[in-house]
């Protein structure tokens, strides 16, 4: 028993960020005369939250009217709570002293815990594109949550991934926390339409996790396959040669025709067709005037895709036979086709 006790009935209080915290405190006596003060923390570095005697505390209101006669309820409300407000709050009775007021009795303290929602997860992929069969890393970050417990999962097209590492910082006590996770994803040729999803679950989200996404279309590069074919004769002394550029992504592509190593024409892919998997096809053709050549002609379709080293495919066009005697099939059969990749 004591002549005055300061009672803080709540050992802990849990409040969502943005809400108002009520910290309860009553005194068993008004004697000795002196003010009540609220502090966050203990010891010399404690922070004054409210002083009954004097001061301006815009976020703090008293639950009771402290000017009311013989009031012994010194509970306070703190508005617009943020994670930075977390800590242990002490209701302290002072007695008048000479010259300064003297701390008389302290309550046992109320620990204020703040529940703060994590920020929307931000997923970022590699800086440079990568090709199928390569492994790329994706990172996911979310900040500002409290308490520390949090769950993070990775998905690719709805399938949960297992190859990832996650860290929550800081390791020790803090007002709020951040999560950082890195997942490894193996690319396939079909990934243009794929999505990588980072899913964060936290107590503040009430079972409705937050998701961040990254489209693999921003990460993948599918190199084209080339096919050069000789088409039936279109007119006397003319042969139509086509270069089929298939299954490439992204669309940025430049094609150059070479006749016996000399640039004949350069063009940029424009009117492309899109495949179901999101890759593109494109065709370029070259009309070769056979009569202009005495010897066989080596036609090369050279493709530079998305700033990568050029890929090419060649087709040998024999001019010894009379073009008008060649059928569409025999023309193709009578010409050899060499495939050559230049890196």
């Amino acid at each position: 028993e004591e002549e005055l006790q300061v009672i803080q009935p709540d050992k802990s209080v849990l409040v969502a960020a943005g809400e108002t915290a009520t910290l309860r405190c009553t005194a068993t006596s008004l004697i000795p005369v002196g003010p009540i003060q609220w502090f966050r923390g203990a010891g010399p570095g404690r922070e004054l939250i409210y002083n009954q005697k004097e001061g301006h505390f815009p976020r703090v209101t008293t639950v009771s009217d402290l000017t009311k006669r013989n009031n012994m309820d010194f509970s306070i409300r703190i508005g617009n709570i943020t994670p930075a407000d977390a800590g242990t709050y002490y209701c302290v009775k002072f007695r008048k002293g000479s010259p300064d007021d003297v701390e008389f009795k302290s309550g046992a303290g109320t620990e204020l815990s703040v529940r703060a929602k994590p920020s929307a997860p931000v997923v970022s992929g590699p800086a440079a594109r990568a090709t199928p069969q390569h492994t790329v890393s994706f990172t996911c970050e979310s900040h500002g949550f409290s308490p520390r417990d949090i769950t993070l999962k990775w998905f690719k097209n709805g399938n949960e991934l297992s190859d990832f590492q996650t860290n929550v910082d800081p390791v020790g006590e803090s007002v709020s926390y951040s999560i950082h996770s890195t997942a490894k994803v193996v690319l396939t040729r079909e990934d243009v339409h794929s999505q990588v999803i980072c899913e964060v679950a936290h107590v503040t989200l009430q079972g409705d996790p937050l998701r961040g996404t990254a489209n693999l279309s921003e990460t993948i590069r599918v190199p084209p396959t080339l096919e050069v074919t000789q088409q039936p004769v279109r007119a006397e002394n003319q042969v139509n040669v086509t270069c089929q550029v298939r299954k490439f992504y992204p669309q940025r592509l430049q094609l150059t025709w070479l006749e016996n190593g000399n640039v004949s024409r350069t063009e940029t892919a424009s009117t492309v067709t899109e495949n179901k998997d999101g890759t593109y096809n494109w065709m370029s053709w070259l009309l070769v005037n056979v009569s202009a050549h005495r010897d066989d002609v080596k036609l090369t379709c050279q493709v530079e895709h998305d700033g990568q080293p050029a890929v090419s495919k060649s087709h040998d066009l024999k001019v010894s036979a009379h073009p008008k005697e060649q059928g569409s099939n025999t023309a193709a059969e009578n010409t050899g086709s060499n495939e050559r990749n230049i890196y």
């Epitope: 002549e3 008004l30 005369v33 009031n71 008048k96 000479s98």
Partner: antibody, heavy 114, light 111 residues
Framework: QVQLQESGPGLVKPSQTLSLTCTVS????????VNWIRQPPGKGLEWIGI???????DYNAALKSRVTISKDTSKNQVFLKLSSVTAADTAVYYC????????WGQGTTVTVSS | DIVLTQSPASLAVSPGQRATITCRAS??????????MHWYQQKPGQPPKPLIY???NLESGVPARFSGSGSGTDFTLTINPVEANDAANYYC?????????FGGGTKVEIK
Amino acid sequence: QVQLQESGPGLVKPSQTLSLTCTVSGFSLTGYGVNWIRQPPGKGLEWIGIIWGDGSTDYNAALKSRVTISKDTSKNQVFLKLSSVTAADTAVYYCARAGKMDYWGQGTTVTVSS
Amino acid sequence: DIVLTQSPASLAVSPGQRATITCRASESVDSYGSSFMHWYQQKPGQPPKPLIYLASNLESGVPARFSGSGSGTDFTLTINPVEANDAANYYCQQNNEYPWTFGGGTKVEIK
């Protein structure tokens, strides 16, 4: 139940130091303060000072230079020392519990005389 | 120091009548919504007995015939109805400022 009992010499010579003891029961000296009050014969009450539960003290400025209040918590005793006494210090001396002075001892009479 | 002036210095009251004692402080004894003024009864050869604390609150075991009122500098102790057993000296006391002080006392006699 709560009790306070003053004790000490009934006669003190002028210029000497008056020493009194207040022995308490029914409450803890760490939880409650104890006051000393005196009452000269036929006169009113005068507050001398208080020792709080934490051991800190507050004194009447008129007597502060001559007064010391201390305590021995383990023995449940509070002590008053008043130095350089004169006949004007002749009084009944009371100890009373806490800032509220809700319980009083019966008092002890101290006469200052040669 | 806060000086407490009690009046009257003495009064004689018949049993069943009302006795009113006033205590005027030289400065306010109010702080933080309370008046730190208290009243004591002292009979000859006995220590003071607490009657009223914080101007108007009855101490445990004190008959409801006793009541206190007032704030700031002016306070009143009322005994209604007075009984023969109420003959005593009555003191007001403040502990709002150091040094804590008592009034000079009022002697109540029963006719």
